[in-house]
């Protein structure tokens, strides 16, 4: 039962970990400007995110802007919009993995090979994890070391975004979610059944055995 | 308008120490980032240390670290560049700068001290 | 250290004219990079900082580019008041440092 559990754990975490990355991805709030200095009449909030970036007035009007020209923009920023893209379209590939892997079970009568999709999917998810703390980590870097740079103008220098902490819990959550399933699945196949989740037909197994003899956790 | 008026250059002989200030008017002294830059001779701009708008944080290239100390006091808008065992490639005109709120880098120049090491 | 090599060192141009100044840093330094123009007998003034900003007040004709590590500066339409002494300097990371200058004049 446990192992199941740590599997449907490591999907529902996993699942909350894209969800998290695509707010991240999609929220122009990576770098956060707070203009309150003495040569800003109006204080204003600016958001700068992948895509947008989004001027805040005091009064609580907003205005974003896409920005315009793809070529034209820093090359952090292209790459770490490919980079949340990329990372994203990994777990997307993760998780079609891991749904091969439960619906194998039923057509595939060697019960290594879902064990084995299971593990992939884990790796994969890990993967896009990785993928995700890469663009968050730089950028977050970047704005330290603005920050403590004495020739940076305090009104280039920028605050971490509520993105990039949704970023970072996207990661955790994808890298914690694709361990827990790279964990469920046993180092060797001398293990029994017990140690997958499978959804089994309703005709007698080869071998019949007792009802106790059965692992509860077998059944969805 | 931003003022800076550097004194204290001069002659000096090599192992020497001398102290550079410089007067800052025209704006609030206490919110900026301070620096000082040297030209030598040969024109070449060489930075040599840089001051947090408090004065906690001070920063030095290794060709000064232990020998220049920069200080400021900002209740006599005051800056103030401590300078010993001077060496002959110390020779240059020293800079007192202002950063900016807006800008990066050295964005205000005074007119400059010339030091001279020499024998 | 961070190497800013910076050429031409002497440039001679005539009024009207378009002229460019490059300076190239030893390795990475982002868009951290201002340029100076000290006219003789003057202390240095700001014209661009972030590569590409320009300072308010420095004529449009000046601009700033960057290219990976190869940074630029461009006058178009070249005017006397423009004979001077451009250097480029990063501030990317500690000791910054200055290109060695370019001593710009008029033909």
């Known amino acids: 039962m446990a192992s199941a559990g740590m599997q449907i754990l490591g999907v529902v975490l996993t699942l909350l970990g894209w969800v998290n990355g695509l707010v991240s991805c999609a929220l122009p709030m990576w770098k956060v400007t707070a203009f309150i200095g003495n040569s800003i009449v109006v204080a204003q909030v600016v958001w700068e995110g992948l895509w947008m970036s989004c001027v805040v007035q005091s009064t609580g009007q907003m205005q974003c802007k896409v920005y315009d020209s793809l070529l034209a923009l820093p090359q952090d920023l292209q790459a770490a919009r490919a980079l949340c893209v990329i990372a994203l379209l990994v777990a997307l590939f993760g998780l079609l993995v891991y749904l091969a892997g439960a619906k194998c079970t039923t057509c595939v009568e060697e019960k290594d090979s879902k064990a084995r999709l299971v593990l992939t999917s884990g790796i994969v998810f890990v993967i896009s994890g990785v993928l995700t703390l890469i663009p968050v980590c730089w950028t977050a870097h970047a704005i330290i070391r603005d920050f403590y740079n004495p020739l940076v103008a305090e009104a280039q220098k920028r605050e971490l975004g509520a993105s990039l902490y949704l970023g970072w819990a996207a990661s955790g959550l994808l890298l914690l979610g694709g361990g827990l399933l790279c964990c469920t699945c046993p180092s060797g196949g001398s293990q029994g059944p017990s140690h997958y989740m499978a959804r089994y037909s309703t005709s007698a197994p080869a071998i019949s055995r007792g009802p106790s003899e059965y692992p509860t956790k077998n059944y969805v | 308008e931003v003022k800076l008026v550097e004194s204290g250059g001069g002659l000096v002989k090599p192992g020497g120490s001398l102290k550079l200030s410089c007067a800052a008017s025209g704006f609030t002294f206490n919110v900026y980032t301070m620096s000082w830059v040297r030209q030598t001779p040969a024109k070449r701009l060489e930075w040599v240390v840089t001051i947090s708008s408090g004065g906690g944080r001070t920063y030095y290239p290794d060709s000064v670290k232990g020998r220049f100390t920069i200080s400021r006091d900002n209740a006599r808008n005051t800056l103030y560049l401590q300078m010993s065992s001077l060496r002959s490639e110390d020779t240059a005109m020293y800079y007192c700068?202002?950063?900016?709120?807006?800008?990066?880098?050295?964005?205000?120049w005074g007119q400059g001290t010339l030091v001279t090491v020499s024998t | 250290d961070i190497q800013m090599t910076q050429s031409p060192a002497s440039l001679s141009a005539s009024v009207g004219e378009t002229v460019t100044i490059t300076c190239r840093a030893s390795e990475n330094i982002d868009s951290y990079l201002a340029w100076y123009q000290q006219k003789q007998g003057k202390s240095p003034q700001l014209l661009v900082y972030a590569s590409t900003l320009l300072v308010d007040g420095v004529p449009s004709r000046f601009s700033g580019s960057r290219s990976g590590t190869q940074f630029s500066l461009k006058i178009n339409s070249l005017q006397s008041e423009d004979v001077a002494r451009y250097y480029c300097?990063?501030?990317?990371?500690?000791?910054?440092?200055f290109g060695s200058g370019t001593k710009l004049e008029i033909k």
């Open positions: 700068i202002r950063g900016d709120y807006r800008y990066d880098g050295f964005a205000y």
């Open positions: 300097q990063h501030y990317y990371s500690i000791p910054y440092t």
